[in-house]
């Protein structure tokens, strides 16, 4: 989750967020021929005391969360971050204006969890 | 990076930091036999554009930071977690007294990334 | 030994402004977070704000009365921590202190002897 | 209104045992929180009394002690002094951003 996100209240749990993302938005539309966009989606939310078992944290996030309740001046919470990724296929032009089709690895979120 | 370092400069980019963990400290003493303590370390820093690459982002991160710079408010930029972790043998009691030894998983940071 | 010693403290108008120092000594002042906390006349401890060290990119953090109004900044160069304060209301008036935070359990383990600021017209 | 809530208030006799609590919620000392203790003097800047809920930093003499239950947190001074007169106050985090959290303060006073 990220440092600019200044909630005074308390955030929720970590989980994935849906996000659709068009690639004309980021401008890829030139050379991307499809999809259009994707269903990308994004983790977000709070990673603390007691990490439950569906946070799939690690034994790190575990043994850090409660560090950082012990000094929490000096030691970050977890953070929530993809644990499952999908890759997508992508038909484009390269730089010699072929049309290509290429799977791109570790393009949609399908979990997140306590890292 | 966690949401609760409300951060309003420009923190240091997405890496490793070292940290030695008491067992003591985590009140897990009477349970653990050895070690005492590990160098757990743990991850932390911003995920900014770009993402350089000793930032080991996923294709998902690097959209991800992109869809952020467009909509801040609602898209937070990716977060510095641990992209390859150890593990450590630990000697201890179980339930019934008996003296164990067993390799937990994921218990030091190796490196950290952008995800 | 440890040691923090605040100035720049002193009378000025509602709407002013001044710049507080705590200047430190004894210890490795970039390794550690510090703290601004305030005590207005017989009244407790109100935290004011922090800021990290550089591993975390002096991060700073302010409570709710003073954020938009405060300003924490650090120059580790010359070991010293500065509090901007503008826009001042007569409820800033109170003994600010500069806090340094101990690197195992996060607690005040040294506190400066303390500024007074008085906002009064 | 502080965060974490005292009594304003404790008194005891020289020798006797008085106890000081500390009232906080699910989002901060609730949330798992250290919580650390802090001892003023009058006329002084706060002095760190109890750091970690039970620990003490060198010099603090051990008739003070420290606990933590739940979403409270208790400070506990034995043999009670002239020298104990002063404001204590709680301290801990609030989970939302991980801002520092004080106690209102109790003066004690040595009967």
């Known amino acids: 989750s990220a440092s600019d996100y200044n909630s005074s209240e308390l955030k929720t749990a970590c989980r994935k967020h849906e996000l659709y993302v068009s690639f004309q938005d980021l401008g890829w539309q030139d050379w991307i021929i499809a999809p259009k966009g994707y269903a990308a989606n994004y983790c977000d939310g709070e990673c603390s005391f007691p990490l439950n078992a569906h946070m799939n944290a690690t034994n790190h996030a575990i043994v850090q969360t409660l560090v950082h309740l012990m000094n929490p001046e000096y030691v970050p919470k977890p953070c929530c971050a993809p644990t499952k990724l999908n890759a997508i296929s992508v038909l484009y032009f390269d730089d010699n204006s072929n049309v290509i089709l290429k799977k791109y690895r570790n393009m949609v979120v399908r979990a997140c969890g306590c890292h | 990076s966690a949401s609760d370092y409300n951060s309003s400069e420009l923190k240091t980019a997405c890496r490793k930091h070292e940290l030695y963990v008491s067992f003591q400290d985590l009140g897990w003493q009477d349970w653990i036999i050895a070690p005492k303590g590990y160098a757990a370390n743990y991850c932390d820093g911003e995920c900014s554009f770009p993402l350089n690459a000793h930032m080991n982002a996923t294709n998902h991160a690097i959209v991800q930071t992109l869809v952020h710079l467009m909509n801040p408010e609602y898209v937070p930029k990716p977060c510095c977690a641990p992209t390859k972790l150890n593990a450590i043998s630990v000697l201890y009691f179980d339930d019934n007294s008996n003296v164990i030894l067993k390799k937990y998983r994921n218990m030091v940071v190796r490196a950290c990334g952008c995800h | 030994q440890v040691q923090l010693v605040e100035s720049g403290g002193g009378l000025v108008k509602p709407g002013g402004s001044l710049r507080l120092s705590c200047a430190a000594s004894g210890f490795t002042f970039s390794s550690y977070v510090v703290h601004w906390v305030r005590q207005a006349p017989g009244k407790g401890l109100e935290w004011v704000g922090r800021t990290r060290h550089s591993d975390m990119g002096y991060a700073t953090s302010y409570a709710a009365p003073v954020k938009g109004r405060f300003t924490i900044s650090r120059d580790d160069s010359k070991n010293t921590l500065y509090l901007q304060m503008n826009s001042l209301k007569t409820e800033d008036t109170a003994v600010y202190y500069c806090?340094?935070?101990?690197?195992?359990?996060?607690?005040?383990?040294?506190w400066g002897q303390g500024t007074l600021v008085t906002v009064s017209s | 209104q502080s965060v974490l809530t005292q009594p304003p208030s404790v008194s005891g006799a020289p020798g006797q045992r008085v106890t000081i609590s500390c009232t906080g919620s699910?989002?901060?000392?609730?949330?798992?929180?250290?919580v650390h203790w802090y001892q003023q003097l009058p006329g002084t800047a706060p002095k760190l009394l109890i750091y970690g809920q039970s620990e003490r930093p060198s010099g603090v003499p051990d008739r003070f002690s420290g606990s933590k239950s739940g979403t409270s947190a208790s400070l506990a001074i034995t043999g009670l002094q002239a020298e104990d007169e002063a404001d204590y106050y709680c301290?801990?985090?609030?989970?939302?951003?991980?801002?520092?959290?004080f106690g209102g303060g109790t003066k004690l006073t040595v009967l």
């Open positions: 806090a340094r935070v101990e690197r195992s359990k996060s607690g005040f383990d040294n």
């Open positions: 699910s989002s901060n000392i609730g949330a798992g929180y250290s």
């Open positions: 301290q801990s985090w609030d989970s939302s951003q991980t801002l520092v959290v």
